[in-house]
């Protein structure tokens, strides 16, 4: 039975040209995390594997940095970065937990962070 929940940074906004940290935290389970994937729609951005460490997809290497922690830092944001981002926790024995973050990249300087929320 999957008892865990993923807490994410929720709906967030940031300014064009700036940077943002995407964060997910898996809690309420003692399952062993074996890998965490970060994806944007259907594109793989990065992987953190228990044995191999971090791997950033070559097409994102210039604009994506691992961390802090299991989070992901997106840099030099463009309006095309607006959209859904997913953190996918692969665990044993529970299986897969997925968290969703919606990022809106704004032209103006009125970007504000949204509140955190939980996804079971």
């Amino acid at each position: 039975m999957m008892t865990g929940t993923i807490e994410t940074t929720g709906n967030i906004s940031a300014e064009k040209g700036g940077s943002i940290i995407l964060q997910c935290h898996l809690s309420s389970t003692t399952a062993q995390v074996t890998q965490v994937n970060w994806e944007q729609q259907d594109q793989l951005l990065a992987i953190c594997n228990a044995d191999l460490g971090w791997h950033i997809s070559p097409s994102f290497k210039d604009r994506v940095a691992p961390g802090p922690g299991l989070g992901l830092t997106l840099q030099s944001l463009t309006v095309n970065d607006t959209g859904e981002y997913f953190c996918i926790y692969h665990t044993y024995p529970d299986g897969t937990y997925t968290g969703r973050i919606f990022l809106e990249v704004l032209e103006s300087s009125v970007a504000e962070h949204g509140a955190r929320f939980q996804i079971p």
Partner: antibody, heavy 120, light 107 residues
């Protein structure tokens, strides 16, 4: 087995800087975050920052930003912490520590510590 | 920054006794809590992470529990090698911060 070997004790003048080294062995240096922690008697433990040698990515505690510089030389599998503009408050033992994979900031292996004394 | 408050600051106990050390965080850290043991003049050693997972090689007499903002470390049947200082630390995000420590001494 995993070991982290730190450089020896340092006696430095206030206002100068110090550079401490940490050479891990027993694991793939580029695959794990390596953090630095300050310990001063009566002041407990303080996290300074960490570095991911597999790309040189760094995170810093705001308190140490601008004064601490973390670097890693992958050719010699050695990490360094430089602390500048030293004062007596910087007299402490500094530890390097490896973060557990996929349990970021839970530090599972520690160096033996390097004592730094800032005194004129 | 998240503040970690540890209690008691010091504790005297005898070999064979059971002791509990508690740690409170200033906000919910979702079980991202680690416990370390440190002997005089040595480096800290990881005992527990994610509030309740024992690190490799840690004896089963140690156990961690808690959630939200309240956590504890329990040591059953104290052994002579268990005396020293204990620290809690959240590993929920940056910067990770530590509790002030608990000094466990022999009665």
């Amino acid at each position: 087995q995993v070991q982290l070997q730190q450089s020896g004790a340092e006696l430095v003048r206030p206002g100068t800087s110090v550079k401490i080294s940490c050479k891990p062995s027993g694991y793939i240096f580029t695959n794990y975050w390596l953090g630095w922690v300050k310990q001063r008697p009566g002041h407990g433990l303080e996290w300074i920052g960490d570095i991911y040698p597999g790309g040189g990515y760094t995170n810093y505690n705001e308190k140490f930003k601008g004064r601490a510089t973390l670097t890693a030389d992958t050719s010699s599998s050695t990490a360094y912490m430089q602390l500048s503009s030293l004062t007596s408050e910087d007299s402490a033992v500094y530890f390097c520590a490896r973060s557990r994979q996929l349990a970021s900031y839970a530090m599972d292996y520690w160096g033996q510590g390097t004592s730094v004394t800032a005194s004129s | 920054d998240i503040q970690m408050t540890q209690s008691p600051a010091s504790l005297s106990a005898s070999v064979g006794e059971t002791v509990t050390i508690t740690c409170r965080s200033s906000e919910n850290i979702y079980s991202y809590l680690a416990w370390y043991q440190q002997k005089q003049g040595k480096s800290p050693q990881l005992l527990v992470y994610n509030a309740k997972i024992l690190a490799e090689g840690v004896p089963s007499r140690f156990s961690g529990s808690g959630s939200g903002t309240q956590y504890s470390l329990k040591i059953n049947s104290l052994q002579p090698e268990d005396f020293g200082s204990y620290y809690c630390q959240h590993h929920y995000g940056t910067p990770p911060t530590f509790g002030g420590g608990t000094n466990l001494e022999i009665k």
